[in-house]
Amino acid sequence: VLEVYYTHLRCRCVQESSVFIPRRFIDRIQISPRGNGCPRKEIIVWKKNKSVVCVDPQAEWIQRIMEMLRKKSSSTPPVPVFKRKIP
């Protein structure tokens, strides 16, 4: 079971998955760059079924989505943590 734990640590992901998730099952994605007490980048996926998954940033499929998000947000100033709805 993949879960997001909100503990005293700044890192929230205990386990990460590389398993492909179809976009139609995804509600939104949160990308947290390394820093703020967490030494690694974290990607948290909220699914439409209300469950939450931490995704390995090296997973090929999430890299593709992140690239798409980067292109869409390139016209706006970067923020340290951002969430995007997946259409």
Epitope: S18, F20, P22, R23, R24, F25, N49, E60, W61
Partner: antibody, heavy 120, light 107 residues
Framework: EVKLLQSGGGLVQPGGSLKLSCAAS????????MSWVRRAPGKGLEWIGE????????NYAPSLKDKFIISRDNAKNTLYLQMSKVRSEDTALYYC?????????????WGQGTSVTVSS | DIVMTQSHKFMSTSVGDRVSITCKAS??????VAWYQQKPGQSPKLLIY???YRYTGVPDRFTGSGSRTDFTFTISSVQTEDPAVYYC?????????FGAGTELELK
């Protein structure tokens, strides 16, 4: 134990209609996407369409969306496929399948299949 | 629609052999590919999901690999119970599509 029990198949005349059912047990049916898939004689698997848990999203194979209607009744734990304007090429074994969206994201449980024969 | 092309419709093998079935997607599907086994008179069974992950209870002789457009399903040592039709399936995007299937038979 997860079971998807299918019924409603049989012989139907060209141009006719038929409604297939898929009764689920052993799972929280109302939480899952469900799909219909068919296999015509001598051919491979063909996806018909899928429906999300609350029926707000239904996706069809483009070539089939005008003749098939997918629905579900969560109170009865049952998935349906309404077939209309059937033709001989709709003769196939029809399967319902659970479309997992928690761990695997593929079709992990399948019904036993129900046979539909279109003939005059 | 994304076309999934399985290069062989039939493959003949012997018990103990290593056999690989290939599948090519007409466009990039990342790792959104599953492999199914269907024996005569039975429903399809999920073997591999997300291109390379073995489904619960599937023997470790079955493996999957690949990404983007090229995928491979391998049985490391064919057993007597393995003859079946094997299908690749993309669930990357709607409409979902399957390969035509590869029938594996024993010599």
């Amino acid at each position: 134990e997860v079971k998807l029990l299918q019924s409603g198949g049989g012989l139907v005349q060209p141009g006719g209609s038929l409604k297939l059912s898929c009764a689920a047990s052993g799972i929280d049916f109302s939480r899952y996407w469900m799909s219909w898939v068919r296999r015509a004689p001598g051919k491979g698997l063909e996806w018909i369409g899928e429906i999300n848990p609350d029926s707000s999203t239904i996706n069809y194979a483009p070539s089939l969306k005008d003749k098939f209607i997918i629905s579900r009744d969560n109170a009865k734990n049952t998935l349906y496929l309404q077939m209309s304007k059937v033709r001989s090429e709709d003769t196939a074994l029809y399967y319902c399948a659970r479309q997992d969206d928690y761990d695997y994201y593929a079709m992990d449980y399948w019904g036993q299949g129900t046979s539909v024969t279109v003939s005059s | 629609d994304i076309v999934m092309t399985q290069s062989h419709k039939f493959m003949s093998t012997s018990v103990g052999d290593r056999v690989s079935i290939t599948c090519k997607a007409s466009q990039d599907v990342s790792t959104g590919v599953a492999w199914y086994q269907q024996k005569p008179g039975q429903s399809p069974k999920l073997l591999i999901y997300s291109a390379s992950y073995r489904y619960t209870g599937v023997p470790d002789r079955f493996t999957g690999s690949g990404s983007r457009t090229d995928f491979t399903f391998t049985i490391s040592s064919v057993q007597t119970e393995d003859p079946a039709v094997y299908y690749c399936h993309q669930y990357y995007t709607i409409p979902l599509t399957f390969g035509a299937g590869t029938e594996l038979e024993l010599k």
